[in-house]
């Protein structure tokens, strides 16, 4: 069915069920952010995966305690990051299944790019990351 | 042109349910999604969900999903909403909107014991 | 929820000078095709409402050219050039792009 362009039709692309967002985050060093996945069911449990490189598959993000924190309410799925690092660059992606179907939906994604480097060897890596 | 008509108003009892209809005429039934919109007295409006009639496909709000079913009957391209369990602050205005386009004239639905 | 906040709450405007409403998201509206699903309508006292804007800017057919949406983001605007009589009502800025669709709290635009 036609949305008349009015709102986002959940019929409308791959990434339609799941909906992620901001889709970049720029923070300096220290500072906490937040990610947001809105889904149009909330009949499943929402995870999230992080890759560092745009080649790579991501992978379950192991969640280090006191300073991630996942939480979930209804349809909306918040992963906070407190004091960042360097190597917490990359994109994070939150994934949900479906308690009754089983299948697995997956959000587009959020790049984190960590400002702030304070030696040259990480200023290098940093330009080399792919964009 | 396209038209929406909903169903008279209604006076229900705590608990008790409501059906609303909203017969569409002047366009295809099944292109467009279905919306529900609420609003009450003096208040701001709340999206409740929405369907396709096509294939009955529905996407409710969190804040009614387990009150609310939204269905249409495609032989006479009618949508129904029905809420269910009422309390007094589901007293409002139910509003059909053809893809939040296109708005019904209302139904006024009053919860009172 | 996409929380849409909107002001001011009451707008009393002179015929033929212009009005500006404010209309700010609690998240980016920007979709990941592009599309930034904000928009208005206007319900005039004891009507049902009627579309004013989709998209942004983008009028719906029949809609004067006086009225006009700008905006990105998370803040956008809503602007009548030269007041009407007509254009008495409450204004509402809502958005299509998080589920469950919210809407903004309402501006009501009056005659000074």
């Known amino acids: 069915a036609r949305s008349e362009d009015r709102y986002r039709n959940p019929k409308g692309s791959a990434c339609s069920r799941i909906w992620q967002s901001p889709r970049f985050i720029a923070r300096k060093r220290g500072f906490t952010v937040k990610m947001h996945c809105y889904m149009n069911s909330a009949s499943g449990n929402v995870s999230w995966l992080w890759k560092q490189e745009m080649d790579e598959n991501p992978q379950q993000l192991k969640l280090e305690k006191g300073r991630m924190e996942e939480s979930q309410n209804e349809s909306l799925a918040t992963l906070t990051i407190q004091g960042i690092r360097f190597e917490d660059n990359g994109i994070y992606f939150c994934q949900q299944k479906c308690n009754n179907t089983s299948e697995v939906y997956q959000g587009c994604g959020t790049e984190l790019r960590v400002m702030g480097f304070s030696t040259l060897a990480q200023l290098k890596q940093r330009n080399t990351l792919k964009d | 042109q396209v038209q929406l008509v909903q169903s008279g108003a209604e006076v229900k009892k705590p608990g008790a349910s409501v059906k609303v209809s909203c017969k569409a005429s002047?366009?295809?039934?099944?292109?467009?999604?279905m919306n529900w919109v609420r609003q009450a007295p003096g208040q701001g409006l709340t999206w409740m969900g929405m369907?396709?009639?096509?294939?009955?496909?529905?996407h409710y709000n969190h804040l009614f999903k387990d009150r609310v079913t939204m269905t249409v009957d495609k032989s006479t391209s009618t949508a129904y909403m029905e809420l269910s369990s009422l309390r007094s602050e589901d007293t409002a205005v139910y509003y059909c909107?053809?893809?939040?386009?296109?708005w019904g004239q209302g139904t006024l639905v009053t919860v009172s014991s | 929820d996409v929380v849409m906040t909107q002001s001011p709450l009451s707008l009393p405007v002179t015929l033929g000078q212009p009005a500006s409403i404010s209309c700010k998201s609690s998240?980016?509206?920007?979709?990941?095709?592009?599309?930034?699903?904000l928009n208005w309508f206007q319900q005039r006292p004891g009507q049902s409402p009627r579309p004013l804007i989709s998209?942004?800017?983008k009028l719906d057919s029949g809609v004067p050219d006086r009225f006009s949406g700008s905006g990105s983001g998370t803040d956008f605007t809503l602007k009548i050039s030269r007041v009407e009589a007509e254009d008495v009502g409450v204004y509402y800025c809502w958005q299509g792009t998080h589920f469950p669709l919210t809407f903004g709290g309402g501006t009501k635009v009056e005659i000074k």
């Open positions: 002047g366009y295809s039934f099944t292109t467009y999604w």
């Open positions: 998240l980016s509206l920007l979709d990941s095709e592009g599309k930034t699903y």
């Open positions: 369907i396709d009639p096509s294939d009955s496909e529905t």
């Open positions: 909107t053809r893809a939040i386009g296109y």
């Open positions: 998209l942004v800017s």
